[in-house]
């Protein structure tokens, strides 16, 4: 009998609310044995994937989507999914990517610390690290 | 149908260098981790680096038995992943299998190519 | 690092037996336990992952168990052509690290 598949969730590290050429990763996590994970923007016609999976903790694996700068067409509505053999999972609640101009003056507010749909404790990283730092990473020019 | 092929084996002496090269096909090169295993003759498995996607840094782990003398790395504009060699020691000798990966086990797997170091 | 072992290292056995080979974590690996077959003179093949999904394709004989730091692989009705190497692996965490193998032969 196949097993019901839990919903992943998805956060944005550092935060929902970005400047303007900033950086930001979505980081989605599932159960134990994923094979793909997906990012869709707005709906599903369009989405990245990535077979590049870690061990988040014992019971979650998790995969990162990184936006090296961001733009103003990048705000909007993401989510994630998963395929753990045979079968997709249901989509995890939307986040909500907000984009700011960067004025940098004294009074414009600090970006939002990470904040998720779904746990919003991040399960710590195994004692070997699997997690790179965020740096250089994923354009994904195919989602937009 | 997912396809790898190692090149660039060869015998060497102790002390030298070669890199081998690894030709994939058949799926998403970028979005998937990848791996370089290796075998001594009559021996069991021996993982010996890894290589994660763009989307995470491109992060590098390797085996201790050959931190600092060997680099993984890829170019995912030509498919093709790649593993420098320096240093190389007689217990280096192996057939070299590069792997496509997800999580850290080996799904897909080249046919190998050997790597002799001898003097 | 994460060490595995592997019993037996060699086994006999006859077509249509049922073999059962076993891989010890010296930690806890949270079924981050994958298995290998390897033919003389070919690279390995994966079996399973996640210490009990089987792969596509590889016939339903084989399957996996185990949680924790004990894992146990079957061939419920061993065939000719399952005369190989098989090696366990573990993914939770690197260094990865594969069991010593176990030789299959025909009695």
């Known amino acids: 009998q196949e097993e019901d598949l839990p919903r992943p969730s998805i956060s944005a590290e550092p935060g929902t609310v970005i400047p303007l050429g900033s950086h930001v990763t979505f980081v989605c996590r599932g159960p134990v044995g994923v094979q793909t994970f997906r990012l869709e923007r707005d709906s599903r016609s369009t989405y990245n994937d990535t077979e590049d999976v870690s061990q988040a903790s014992p019971s979650e694996s998790e995969a990162r989507f990184r936006i090296d700068s961001v733009r103003e067409g990048n705000a909007g509505l993401y989510r994630c999914i998963y395929y753990k053999p045979p079968k997709w999972s249901e989509q995890s609640d939307y986040l909500e990517l907000l984009v700011k101009e960067s004025s940098g003056g004294p009074d414009s507010p600090d970006t939002e610390p990470g904040s998720s749909a779904g746990p919003t404790q991040r399960p710590s990283d195994n004692s070997h690290n699997e997690h790179a730092p965020a740096s250089q990473g994923l354009k994904a020019e195919h989602l937009y | 149908e997912v396809q790898l092929v190692e090149s660039g084996g060869g015998l060497v002496q102790p002390g030298g260098s070669l890199k081998l090269s690894c030709a994939a096909s058949?799926?998403?090169?970028?979005?998937?981790?990848m791996y370089w295993v290796r075998q001594a003759p009559g021996k069991g498995l021996e993982w010996v680096a890894r290589?994660?996607?763009?989307?995470?840094?491109?992060?590098?782990y390797y085996a201790d038995s050959v931190k600092g003398r060997f680099t993984i790395s890829r170019d995912d504009s030509k498919n093709t992943l790649y593993l420098q060699m320096n240093s190389l020691k007689t217990e280096d000798t192996a057939v070299y299998y590069c792997?496509?990966?997800?999580?850290?086990?080996?799904?897909?797997w080249g046919q190998g190519t050997l790597v002799t170091v001898s003097s | 690092d994460i060490q595995m072992t592997q019993s037996p290292s060699s086994l006999s056995a006859s077509v249509g037996d049922r073999v059962t080979i076993t891989c010890k974590a010296s930690?806890?690996?949270?079924?981050?336990l994958a298995w290998y077959q390897q033919k003389p003179g070919k690279a390995p093949r994966l079996l399973i992952s996640?210490?009990?999904s089987l792969e596509t394709g590889v016939p339903s004989r084989f399957s996996g168990s185990g949680s924790g730091t004990d894992y146990t692989f079957t061939i419920s009705s061993l065939q000719p052509e399952d005369i190989a190497t098989y090696y366990c692996?573990?993914?939770?965490?690197?260094?990865?690290?594969f069991g010593g193998g176990t030789r299959l032969e025909i009695k």
């Open positions: 792997v496509r990966g997800g999580s850290g086990f080996f799904a897909y």
């Open positions: 692996q573990q993914y939770w965490s690197t260094p990865y690290t």
């Open positions: 996640t210490a009990t």
């Open positions: 930690e806890d690996i949270y079924i981050r």
């Open positions: 290589i994660r996607s763009k989307s995470s840094n491109y992060a590098t």
């Open positions: 058949g799926f998403t090169f970028n979005t998937n981790a």
